[in-house]
């Protein structure tokens, strides 16, 4: 009679993660009498996955009934499988023995590999914010993908880029892999809704990339211009001087009147308007009492834009062409919430 | 066919010892294991122990542990288990069995007994 | 050991009656128990092994069940052939032991 055999008829089994493996395993005879074992990997390290005879293993499930007698079949099936169970699979048939079974003969190996989706793209942006015609450098991350083969591409605004740098790791043979791209993006002014997208494409998303995006808006800062004017005369002794604070990105702003060099009124931006491109404009306005000053008043503009350092602007006006007015009444006309009267 | 042919009945005074001899035929004798079964008069079943007929490998019950000894001869394709120094208690029915369960120990094929007489 | 304690000891039965026999294993042996038929003068016969497979040429009024510690003998429909005595046995690990047995007899 021929020795027994043990037959695994498949060399390599390729599951999607989350789907269950069949493993096949079969003998050529009942003898010698004894149970099938199933193992990952070989030598004295190899995991048992499953036992005829004990233990409890959730995941497996055998094709045919094992307690049967006349039962040659020891295929097995492991459910849910994730990228940590990929490696190769021995069908193996011990003999009855004591005090414990003896192994008898093992199977070729069965190569399971598994596919796993990449998680979606976390794109993260320079933790502070840059101004326009700087370069500013982008992260993509995606994890837990198997097989290693993968494509990564940086948009900005659906204009591919060029300039990025991608690790997939780890190099050698893994489980599942990860990819760390780093793309460098030079802002404009008008990157306000810009975005920045990380697509990446795999064989098991079917041509359907993942994409992870970036809105440039947490990235950039647009500092404002500013002008001061000096509008008509709005009676006889008023002059009405407006600050404007034009294209500016975010909408943090704090401003400051100085007259002659002393705090006059500080405000914050409140009622914006916004511009196409995303950025904003604001206007502070000051009523100054002209019959109060005997000589030129230096009016000085001071935006403190999103924690940076002040810029200002100023504007000399000229008192000489208004003499004040023996006995007159110097307090000037409140307004309006903006107004500022100077004595 | 398949089966299992045991020898005689044996009579012993104590303090003797036995050799039951148990001849499988109809099927590849080396493939499977043979335990040993006795049963007294009037009694229940007990176990005795095992014997791997592919590689002489052995397990006795602890009772019995130092007295009993089995082997198998498998050009003959046949098992024996010797008994030594013989006790009135050990007159029982002696059986082979063929031990058929992959993972787990039944025995689907037994032989007829030998009846073992222990007595002065 | 394993201790295996069958019951009850005996059964008193009609032809044509429903029988169970119960045995309670002293620690889990997974499905691994066999039943045995013995009828005065003979050898035992094999009916049921791994708790609920019947061995083959046995009637099908012949039924086991249960697992770990608790397992059951069904005759469904007592035939004159089947008074005898039931033995079960556990096969999960040496040393192999029996139950004390069941005796069917004629009520």
């Known amino acids: 009679e021929e020795e027994l055999q043990v037959i695994q008829p498949d060399k390599s089994v390729l599951v999607a993660a989350g789907e269950t493996a069949t493993l096949r395993c079969t003998a050529t005879s009942l003898i010698p009498v004894g149970p099938i074992q199933w193992f990952r990997g070989a030598g004295p390290g190899r995991e048992l996955i499953y036992n005829q005879k004990e233990g409890h293993f959730p995941r497996v499930t055998t094709v045919s009934d094992l307690t049967k007698r006349n039962n040659m079949d020891f295929s097995i099936r492991i459910g849910n499988i994730t990228p940590a169970d990929a490696g190769t699979y021995y069908c193996v048939k011990f003999r009855k023995g004591s005090p414990d079974d003896v192994e008898f003969k093992s199977g070729a190996g069965t190569e399971l590999s598994v596919r796993a989706k990449p998680s979606a793209p976390v794109v993260s942006g320079p933790a502070a914010r840059a101004t326009p015609q700087h370069t500013v450098s982008f992260t993509c991350e995606s994890h837990g993908f198997s097989p290693r083969d993968i494509t990564l591409k940086w948009f900005k605004n659906g204009n591919e880029l060029s300039d990025f740098q991608t690790n997939v790791d780890p190099v050698g043979e893994s489980v599942s892999y990860s990819i760390h791209s780093t793309a460098k993006v030079v802002l404009t002014r008008e990157d306000v809704h810009s975005q920045v997208i990380c697509e990446v494409a795999h064989v098991t998303l079917q041509g359907d990339p993942l994409r992870g995006t970036a809105n440039l808006s947490e990235t950039i800062r647009v500092p404002p211009t500013l002008e001061v004017t000096q509008q008509p005369v709005r009676a006889e002794n008023q002059v009405n001087v407006t600050c404007q604070v034009r294209k500016f990105y975010p909408q943090r702003l704090q401003l400051t009147w100085l007259e002659n060099g002393n705090v006059s009124r500080t405000e914050t931006a409140s009622t914006v308007t916004e511009n196409k491109d995303g950025t904003y404009n604001w206007m502070s306005w000051l009523l100054v009492n002209v019959s109060a000053h005997r000589d030129d008043v230096k009016l000085t503009c001071q935006v403190e834009h999103d924690g940076q350092p002040a810029v200002s602007k100023s504007h000399d006006l000229k008192v000489s062409a208004h003499p004040k007015e023996q006995g007159s009444n110097t307090a000037a006309e409140n307004t309006g919430s903006n107004e500022r009267n100077i004595y | 066919q398949v089966q299992l042919v045991q020898s005689g009945a044996e009579v012993k005074k104590p303090g003797a010892s036995v050799k039951v001899s148990c001849k499988a035929s109809?099927?590849?004798?080396?493939?499977?294991?043979i335990s040993w079964v006795r049963q007294a008069p009037g009694q229940g079943l007990e176990w005795m122990g095992w014997?791997?007929?592919?590689?002489?490998?052995?397990n006795y019950a602890q009772k019995l542990q130092g007295r009993v000894t089995m082997t198998t001869d498998t050009s003959t394709s046949t098992a024996y288990m010797e008994l030594r120094s013989l006790r009135s208690d050990d007159t029982a029915v002696y059986y082979c069995?063929?031990?058929?369960?992959?993972?787990?120990?039944?025995?689907?094929?037994w032989g007829r007994g030998t009846l073992v007489t222990v007595s002065s | 050991d394993i201790q295996m304690t069958q019951s009850p000891s005996s059964v008193s039965a009609s032809v044509g009656d429903r029988v169970t026999i119960t045995c309670r294993a002293s620690?889990?042996?997974?499905?691994?128990l066999a039943w045995y038929q013995q009828k005065p003068g003979k050898a035992p016969k094999l009916l049921i092994y791994?708790?609920?497979n019947l061995q083959s040429g046995v009637p099908s009024r012949f039924s086991g069940s249960g697992s770990g510690t608790d397992f059951t003998l069904t005759i469904s429909s007592l035939q004159p052939e089947d008074f005898a005595t039931y033995y079960c046995?556990?096969?999960?690990?040496?040393?192999?032991?029996f139950g004390g047995g069941t005796k069917v007899e004629i009520k």
């Open positions: 069995a063929r031990e058929a369960g992959s993972s787990w120990y039944d025995f689907d094929l």
């Open positions: 109809g099927y590849t004798f080396h493939g499977y294991g």
């Open positions: 014997i791997s007929a592919y590689s002489g490998e052995t």
């Open positions: 620690q889990g042996i997974s499905s691994w």
């Open positions: 791994a708790a609920s």
């Open positions: 046995q556990q096969g999960a690990s040496f040393p192999i032991t």
